[in-house]
């Protein structure tokens, strides 16, 4: 272990402690305006007042006091578009990744009192205002309800809802986690006339059941319809209701494109284009074909028509359609043409402009980099993010394309703003992008700023993390490097976190942190003070993160390399990187470890069992151990089906259990929460069984009643303390 460099008293900086990390001492703040118009926004202040801001008049005032919030223990709020009412959210109770239930109260801003009569039932699964006025749509017990006004009795739109069977307006488990990435599955039309929603029928889906121990004499069983690879999937239908006359025509079903409906399929997203035009995206179960379908309301028929000539097909010949998800369209003002990110002929994801057919799409961006997200399309500008600048895949800058100009001109809005501090941005735009907020995540301290949408001038600093900056002044932070290494024809970007007094002539233990899942990215130019920062700062460990094949934003050749063969190249590339790091001369070959969580737990397990002798020890937290145990939408996207005539062989070959014998010469710590709804405890149970059967010694820790995040304060403290002890023991570092 490198000896500490002596520093005179006057300049003493301390190393990070594990306690600092567990207490969140050095966490940062971001500032996202809650836009309510072109130039107005709301923000919840530190003391929980809801404050109204007008950028142009510079006025600000409290629209909802913290005492009103506190009177119902509210933790969130939502202003109705007519500004007459606010919903207050309390009793937040987390369900899965995005979903939660809550109690809602409606506060009348005009009268300064809560709306009495026809109070909302509790707990509600989802609630939202219409985009105009103050209609309310909410989901209660898997059914959708509509209120024309907050004080009105509700109209029940659906009656089919049944716990764990039929979900209306909210996704089931697999759609929430793997397709929509939201807690809701209903969308208001821009004028609030129509409400589109999805019905998910899980009646035929197999159930995952696990024990929740709680405090009772008997554990209770959690049952979730959860389709694993190859299992029966949810049956989805999309309906649209006229909210003015919901009781007249009833829900109108939107037809599924023929080429999609001919076999198992998914609904992937819905985008309202105008008050009477909607765009639905569908995906075949074999996820290489996506269809975007534009549908119009025909007043004369009183129906939604989706003409074949308004179907746009997106197909991948080298892998799956889209990135992690299929991208969504950003429609122009004409409500016909749209901008969309998909792979160009060279396999890089770029913005295309579609006017009539995908075949005639005009490519808007191009190069050996990728467009990542379209934020906003206005009359004359398109704002998007990409990793183009200076060729670093792990950066994000915001660009503006002036689409009014011919040819369109491109400007990087963020590239040179705070170049050292800020290389990874996101943005939040007011309604027509008259103003926007930029949120910079690093590599320096995060900072949020407000900008003029016409000139891009900075108007105001919203949050600059001054307190954090001050408290970090006396901390010895590690040095972070982002570089690339080459192996054969491949380039791998890596992030290295070096101990504060790093000396290239000395030897250091190395910890590889891996995720490595398809379309993920670990090497990002973001600020973080976390467990690995502590390990470098205090324990003198070199940390490395490597983006191998299968990771995102470097083109389809790199991304699709893992298609139908998960668990091969992701592992191989981590091993390649470790060998390259050893060649750098400052790594102690006898003290190399690897750790990962979730997909990273799978990769770390396979790397430990690679038989290379590179690793002394490693940790897998909540690992996938077989793709047959994981969700259909995810597993099949990258692996196909676990059937004999498809890809069963590789499903079997790529399990951790198949490599049990190879764990004999490494120290392995296996960790899992028993109430993991996502990567089921089953995965670790099967690894443990295989290791026992192979008579291989290993260490294990379970966290009772903890889910995939092992998030409870006590569990997290225990987890990181436990992993720290394990690593220090492995690296022979004294306590």
């Amino acid at each position: 272990r490198p000896s500490r460099v002596y520093k005179p008293e006057g300049n003493t900086k301390r190393a990070l402690t594990l306690k600092d990390i567990l207490n969140g001492t050095f966490s940062y703040k971001t500032y996202f305006p809650n836009w309510i118009s072109e130039q107005e926004y709301l923000h919840q202040s530190e003391d929980d007042n809801i404050v109204f801001y007008n950028i142009e008049t510079r006025e600000s005032y409290i629209i909802l006091s913290n005492s009103t919030m506190k009177s119902v223990n509210a933790t969130d709020y939502g202003l109705s578009p007519d500004r007459q009412f606010v919903y207050l959210e309390s009793d937040y109770s987390k369900l899965w990744r995005y979903s939660y239930t809550a109690t809602y109260y409606i506060y009348d801003l005009q009268n300064g009192e809560f709306v009495r009569g026809y109070e909302l039932p509790r707990p509600i699964q989802y609630l939202c205002w219409s985009p105009v006025g103050s209609k309310l749509a909410y989901v209660y017990q898997n059914n959708i309800y509509l209120k024309q006004r907050p004080g009105d009795p509700p109209f029940q739109i659906t009656y089919t809802g049944r716990e764990n069977r039929i979900f209306n307006g909210i996704p089931d488990w697999v759609y929430e986690e793997e397709m929509l990435a939201t807690k809701y599955a209903l969308w208001w039309s821009p004028d609030g006339k129509f409400l589109a929603y999805v019905e998910f029928n899980d009646s035929d889906i197999p159930i995952i059941a696990y024990s929740y121990y709680g405090d009772g004499q008997y554990p209770r069983t959690i049952n979730i319809p959860y389709p694993k690879a190859g299992a029966k999937n949810p049956v989805v239908r999309v309906f649209i209701v006229d909210t003015t006359y919901p009781h007249h025509v009833g829900p109108m079903e939107v037809p599924v494109p023929e080429m999609i409906a001919s076999s198992d399929y998914y609904f992937s997203w819905l985008t309202w284009v105008s008050s009477e035009r909607v765009c639905l995206q569908w995906l075949k179960r074999v996820q290489n074909v996506s269809v975007l379908s534009i549908c119009d309301f025909r007043e004369d028929w009183h129906a939604w028509e989706c003409p074949k000539n308004q179907e746009h097909v997106e197909e991948s010949r080298t892998g799956w359609a889209g990135g992690f998800f299929v991208s969504t369209p950003a429609f122009s003002q004409d409500a016909t043409s749209y901008y969309k990110i998909f792979s160009d002929k060279d396999g890089y994801k770029h913005i295309h402009y579609i006017k009539d057919t995908v075949e005639n799409a005009i490519q808007i961006t191009s190069g050996k980099w990728e467009a990542i997200y379209i934020f906003r399309v206005t009359q004359d500008s398109l704002f998007y993010s990409s990793n183009e600048f200076e060729g670093y895949p792990g950066r994000r800058n915001i660009y503006r394309i002036s689409i009014g100009n011919s040819p369109p001109s491109k400007k990087c809005v963020t590239c040179h703003l705070r170049k050292e501090r800020c290389q990874y941005y996101t943005a939040s735009f007011s309604y027509k992008a008259k103003y926007y907020a930029l949120v910079c995540y690093g590599p320096g301290l995060p900072i949020s700023t407000l900008h003029d949408g016409r000139t891009d001038q900075e108007i105001q600093v919203l949050e600059e993390n001054k307190e954090l900056e001050n408290s970090l002044r006396n901390i010895q932070l590690p040095k972070v490097e982002i570089k690339k290494l080459k192996d054969g024809g491949l380039t791998f970007w890596y992030k290295m976190i070096l101990p504060p007094q790093f000396d290239r002539s000395k030897k250091y233990p190395l910890l590889i942190q891996v995720y490595g899942g398809p379309c993920s990215q670990s090497v990002k130019s973001v600020f973080a003070v976390n467990w690995i920062t502590y390990l470098a700062s205090k324990e003198g460990i070199v940390i490395a993160l490597v983006d191998g094949r299968g990771t995102a934003f470097q083109g389809d050749k790199f991304l699709h390399a893992v298609y139908r063969k998960l668990g091969v190249y992701e592992v191989e590339d981590q091993l390649t990187a470790v060998r390259k790091f050893i060649e750098m001369g400052f790594i102690d070959e006898e003290r190399i470890a690897i750790w990962g969580w979730s997909y990273g737990g799978y990769v770390s397990s396979l790397a430990l069992a690679s038989g290379t002798g590179l690793f002394k020890c490693g940790i897998a937290v909540a690992p996938v151990s077989s793709w047959e145990y994981y969700a259909s939408i995810y597993s099949e996207r990258f692996m196909g089906l676990p059937t004999k005539d498809d890809n069963l062989e590789h499903y079997k070959n790529s399990t951790v259990m198949a490599r049990a014998e190879y764990f004999r010469n490494v120290d392995y710590l296996l960790i899992h929460g028993t109430a993991d709804d996502n990567v089921h405890f089953q995965n670790s149970a099967q690894i443990a069984k295989a290791l026992v059967n192979a008579q291989v010694d290993f260490q294990a820790m379970w966290y009772s009643d903890q889910n995939h995040g092992i998030l409870s304060g006590r569990s997290q403290n225990h987890l990181y303390t436990h992993m720290t002890h394990f690593l220090k023991q492995c690296f022979s570092l004294s306590d």
Epitope: G117, Y118, Q148, D152, P153, P154, F155, Q156, T158, Y159, T160, R237, F239, T244, Y245, P246, H247, H248, V249, G250, P251, M252, E253, P255, R298, D300, W301, H302, A303
Partner: antibody
């Protein structure tokens, strides 16, 4: 002009079955929810069942649930009500009406169903 | 289910008079979801008043609907000979849709 024409009514013994039809014309049938409403002799109106335009959602009054089935054939512009296990209290004039839970703006002339031994 | 109670059961009036028919709901319905129908002997019902107390197509303006919450009224400002019939209110806010028992408007 919107027209709804019911047929299939008649005399049936308790426990028997009957299938009512309603032929629709003058509007885009497949786009609209349709309902069956009945009226026992000398009594008021009672909603029996409803079906949305695509046929994908159906609802029933508790009094007929499990015995009656509403369906539609949009290619034939026809609404159906399959009535099984008929009881004396099902005796009524059965109307087909254009609408879902309300706003029944067009009605057929009705067909009489008599359940008697 | 929501029970609709109509009163009076029978209303005896002369042509030209004003008729006021009442409909009370067991729970709030709001005018958005309350409709009124007219039925003459041997005929199918006919929609009179629809969403938000609006007259249905082709209904003369002597018919008007009002009310909110649980209390609703159908008013016929000047009875014409063809208006003598049975009138039903109906709620469509909740399954099952229900009808009132009817008010018979007869010639005095």
């Amino acid at each position: 002009e919107v027209q709804l024409l019911e047929s299939g009514g008649g005399l049936v013994q308790p426990g028997g079955s009957l299938r009512l039809s309603c032929a629709a014309s003058g509007f885009t049938f497949s786009s609209y929810a349709m309902s069956w409403v009945r009226q026992a002799p000398g009594k008021g109106l009672e909603w029996v069942s409803g079906i949305i335009g695509s046929g994908g959602i159906t609802y029933y009054a508790d009094s007929v649930k499990g015995r009656f089935t509403i369906s539609r054939d949009n290619s034939k512009n026809t609404l159906y009500l399959q009535m099984n296990s008929l009881r004396a209290e099902d005796t009524a004039v059965y109307y087909c009406a254009k609408g879902w839970f309300g706003g029944f703006n067009y009605w057929g002339q009705g067909t009489l169903v008599t359940v008697s031994s | 289910e929501i029970v609709l109670t109509q009163s009076p059961g029978t209303l005896s009036l002369s042509p030209g008079e004003r008729a006021t028919l009442s409909c009370r709901a067991s729970q709030s319905v709001t005018s958005s979801y309350l409709a009124w129908y007219q039925q003459k002997p041997g005929q199918a019902p006919r929609l009179l008043i629809n969403v938000g107390s609006r007259r249905a197509t082709g209904i003369p303006d002597r018919f008007s609907g009002s009310g909110s919450g649980t209390d609703f009224t159908l008013t016929i400002s000047r009875l014409e000979p063809e208006d003598f019939a049975v009138y039903y209110c109906q709620q469509g806010i909740m399954l099952p849709p229900t009808f009132g028992q009817g008010t018979k408007v007869e010639i005095k």
